[in-house]
Interface confidence: low
């Protein structure tokens, strides 16, 4: 399914853009990559409120969204092998652009410890309920979709697009209508803060009244982290309205002349920039020149500042930014070292766990210690990581290899097991002869016995499960597979078709099997192939039968 | 400076509509919610409803549910609202307030208000 | 709704003294770790003006002898030494939840 861009939010360096559309995480984040961001992070309170605002304003014009609760995919993710971490606030998860683990969570109940599979996070909203801005939505984690399957309940993404700076947007001292046009090819009339690179098309005018005017204006960075549209005055101005139509497009002051013109001007302590419109102030820290936590510091007199860095960080070449210092480069850590703000962080490789003897050590997880263990049946701990195996008579199954599933002996691909009925059961399997033959003590072959018309040999009933497997002693039991707890069997009878020659006796077993040919005291090699008789269990009216378990290896006994 | 300027008094009958508008200057108008709150004789205050500028979304108490409607007009900064149906008890003073965008939305800049006086 | 109870619902003093003013809500205003509870004053014939914010941020220019504590459903609004033009009414407002509601108020006379 497409995705629609429904709504965007640009505030601070970044623009948000919400879509709808039922896809995937990795169609999504492929989506809002193909023009230039990602799935969006919430890395604060104030990002969510961001995401909240984009949110609000696409399920407002979004008619469709019939779901009660609804999820929005976000860019937070947790590979395949890498487990949960309770400890940190992002429980292992990580966010799609990189960067460090971030404090803010707001989780939607507790997680599940899995590591088998990859897992993606999306936003939960209410749709019940109104988007209260102090109601930030949840982070809800689960299976990530796949083409054509998206996912419980998604109905849609939410991207990031970052930027260098944003233009304010123009002011319109008269009628007309702006249309910009974002690098992420989102068209808008109403944004708070215009990204760098954007385009601006403004139509003067009242539509049919008069005559349309067009400019066109290109958000450009006129100086370091000073971006401005290179406009001169407020546009579309008319003598008709004057200062009247939106304050005359000026930021702060409209003086009018005499003739209907007019001029922006500022309040004290503030001055006109370049563009007529705009007033800054005449403090130079009220531009924020300084970047990356770095604090404007007036000098003597006002006139001019110096910028100074928090403790653990230090000015740039450019004396306006705070960089931090890398205490990785002293390697105290025993495996990853992380980098962070003012400080760093010791990290352990996916399948360790902080701990052990020294600052940033890291220990083995055990995977299969007593309720942990991923695995169905058999567990195998190793350093840094874990293997799943199977009993005898089943074989690893599942996407991640931590299931185990029978082994039907009966269709393998080495061929028949059995030289005649063979029974699958769970993790094992039970040979057993046409009726007037008998099993072999090696419980594969079947020999000659007493003339009999019965049916043949089946698996034993539920009351005879105390015997041993293994024996090849010839019990009374019926071909009909006895029946596990819910009701499906347990054991199929399959059986391998002899070639047939012309004097080939036919006996009257419900089975509608036929005797094997050659000689009457040797069961012959089956010639074709295994295939389970009839289409179902049949209801045999009793007899004798000869039957015997074996492992897959063909040995006789238990597992 | 920050300011928001209320239109003048009303009297109006009961059964009809009154339209007040809210002006505001000294900041960016579409960066605010806007929220209308009105105060009867000797009563609390009383949240009627909010709209978001910059997109005109509204948010109403469900007690005036159907006989309020806010919307705003950018160009001109203002922003209005309508009750209908008036009847006594809607005598009030009637304010415009503004609020953060984000959050907790306290009204930080309040209008001086409107008294609006319905009587037969 | 929730329900916003202010108590007392008048209170002499005098200057100089410190006054203390309740407000108790139906249900909990507190949300991810902040309180959604907010501190209007009020003269005769005037609009309301905001003092505290998020039941104990002091609203710019507020005078620092207004404060406000509290979390849940309960909070306070302290004036630690009353001065002329404190006398007023105070109200408690929720922004938790639609509609927003506020107190009954608490009219603050000269002894």
């Known amino acids: 399914t497409g995705a629609d861009t429904e709504a965007v939010v640009c505030v601070g360096t970044a623009c948000y853009t919400a879509h709808s559309g039922k896809l995937s995480a990795a169609e999504a984040q492929n989506h809002c990559n193909q023009n230039g961001g990602n799935l969006a992070t919430v890395k604060s309170k104030e990002e969510a409120q961001h995401v909240q605002r984009v949110l609000a304003q696409l399920l407002r014009r979004e008619a469709a969204l019939t779901a009660r609760m609804s999820k929005f995919w976000i860019g937070l993710q947790r590979e395949k092998g890498k487990c949960l971490d309770p400890s940190l606030p992002l429980k292992g998860f990580s966010w799609v652009g990189g960067g460090e683990d971030t404090p803010y969570s707001n989780w939607h109940k507790e997680l599940r410890n899995s590591c088998i599979s990859k897992r993606c996070v999306s936003l939960l909203l209410d749709l019940s309920q109104p988007l209260l801005p102090s109601r930030l939505p949840k982070w809800s984690e689960g299976p990530c979709g796949s083409p054509g399957s998206p996912g419980s309940n998604i109905e849609g993404f939410v991207c990031k697009f970052s930027f260098k700076g944003m233009c304010r947007p123009l002011a319109l001292g008269g009628p007309g209508q702006v249309t910009y046009t974002t690098p992420f090819q989102t068209t808008s009339s109403s944004l708070e803060a215009v990204p760098f690179a954007s385009a601006a098309n403004v139509a003067c005018g009242e539509g049919d009244k008069d005559e349309t005017q067009s400019h066109y204006f290109l958000c450009k960075e006129k100086a370091p982290d000073v971006f401005d549209w290179g406009s001169s005055g407020p546009l579309c101005v008319s003598p008709k309205y004057g200062c009247n139509f939106n304050n005359g497009g000026c930021h702060q002051d409209c003086f009018e002349g005499g003739d209907g013109s007019f001029l922006c001007g500022c309040r004290p302590g503030f001055r006109l920039l370049d563009d007529l419109v705009t007033c800054a102030s005449r403090n130079p820290c009220s531009s924020s020149p300084c970047r990356g936590g770095a604090t404007c510091v007036l000098g003597p007199h006002g006139k001019n500042y110096t910028c100074r860095c928090p403790q653990g960080y230090q000015l740039d070449s450019s004396q306006l930014d705070c960089v931090d210092v890398d205490e990785c480069q002293d390697s105290p850590c025993a495996q990853e070292c992380v980098n962070t703000p003012g400080g760093f962080r010791c990290e352990c490789w996916v399948g360790y766990e902080p701990g052990g003897p020294g600052e940033g050590a890291c220990q083995d997880v055990d995977e299969c210690a007593l309720g942990r263990s991923p695995c169905a049946q058999g567990c195998t701990n190793t350093d840094g990581s874990f293997h799943c195996s199977c009993e005898e008579g089943y074989v690893l199954a599942g996407e991640d290899g931590t299931q185990c599933q029978d082994v039907d002996e009966c269709v393998g691909p080495g061929g028949p097991l059995c030289d005649s009925l063979c029974f699958n059961t769970q993790g094992s399997f039970h040979c057993g002869c046409l009726p007037g033959w008998v099993l072999a003590p090696n419980g594969v072959s079947c020999t000659m016995g007493p003339v009999s018309l019965g049916p043949p040999s089946g698996p034993p009933d539920e009351e005879d499960k105390g015997e041993k497997e293994g024996s090849t002693v010839p019990r009374a039991a019926t071909a009909s597979p006895t029946r596990g707890p819910e009701g499906t069997p347990k054991a199929t009878p399959t059986t391998s078709r002899p070639s047939l020659s012309s004097d080939a006796p036919i006996t009257s077993a419900p089975l509608k099997m036929l005797a094997p040919s050659g000689s009457p005291g040797v069961w012959r090699e089956p010639s074709i192939h295994h295939a389970t008789a009839a289409s179902g269990p049949q209801e045999p009216a009793g007899g004798d039968s000869s039957v015997a378990t074996q492992n897959n290896d063909g040995t006789d006994g238990q597992k | 400076q920050v300011q928001l300027v209320e239109s003048g008094a009303e009297v109006k009958k009961p059964g009809a509509s009154v339209k007040l508008s809210c002006k505001a200057s000294?900041?960016?108008?579409?960066?605010?919610?806007m929220h209308w709150v009105r105060q009867a004789p000797g009563q609390r205050l009383e949240w009627m409803g909010e709209i978001d500028p910059s997109a005109s979304y509204t948010y109403y108490n469900q007690k005036f549910k159907g006989r309020v409607t806010i919307t705003v007009d950018k160009s001109a900064s203002t922003a209005y609202m309508e009750l209908s149906s008036l009847r006594s008890e809607d005598t009030a003073v009637y304010y415009c307030?503004?609020?953060?965008?984000?959050?907790?939305?306290?009204?930080?800049?309040w209008g001086p208000g409107t008294t609006v006086t319905v009587s037969s | 709704d929730i329900q916003m109870t202010q108590s007392p619902s008048s209170l002499s003093a005098s200057v100089g003294d410190r006054v203390t003013i309740t407000c108790r809500a139906s249900?909990?205003?507190?949300?991810?770790?902040?309180?959604?509870m907010n501190w209007y004053q009020q003269k005769p014939g005037k609009a309301p003006k905001l003092l505290i914010y998020?039941?104990?941020n002091l609203e710019s220019g507020v005078p620092s002898r207004f404060s406000g504590s509290g979390s849940g459903t309960d909070f306070t609004l302290t004036i630690s030494s009353l001065e002329d033009e404190d006398f007023a009414t105070y109200y408690c407002?929720?922004?938790?939840?639609?509609?927003?509601?506020f107190g009954g108020g608490t009219k603050l006379e000269i002894k």
């Open positions: 407002q929720q922004t938790n939840e639609d509609p927003r509601t």
């Open positions: 000294g900041y960016t108008f579409t960066s605010y919610w």
């Open positions: 998020a039941a104990s």
């Open positions: 307030a503004r609020s953060v965008y984000y959050g907790n939305k306290y009204f930080d800049v």
């Open positions: 249900q909990s205003v507190d949300y991810a770790g902040d309180s959604y």
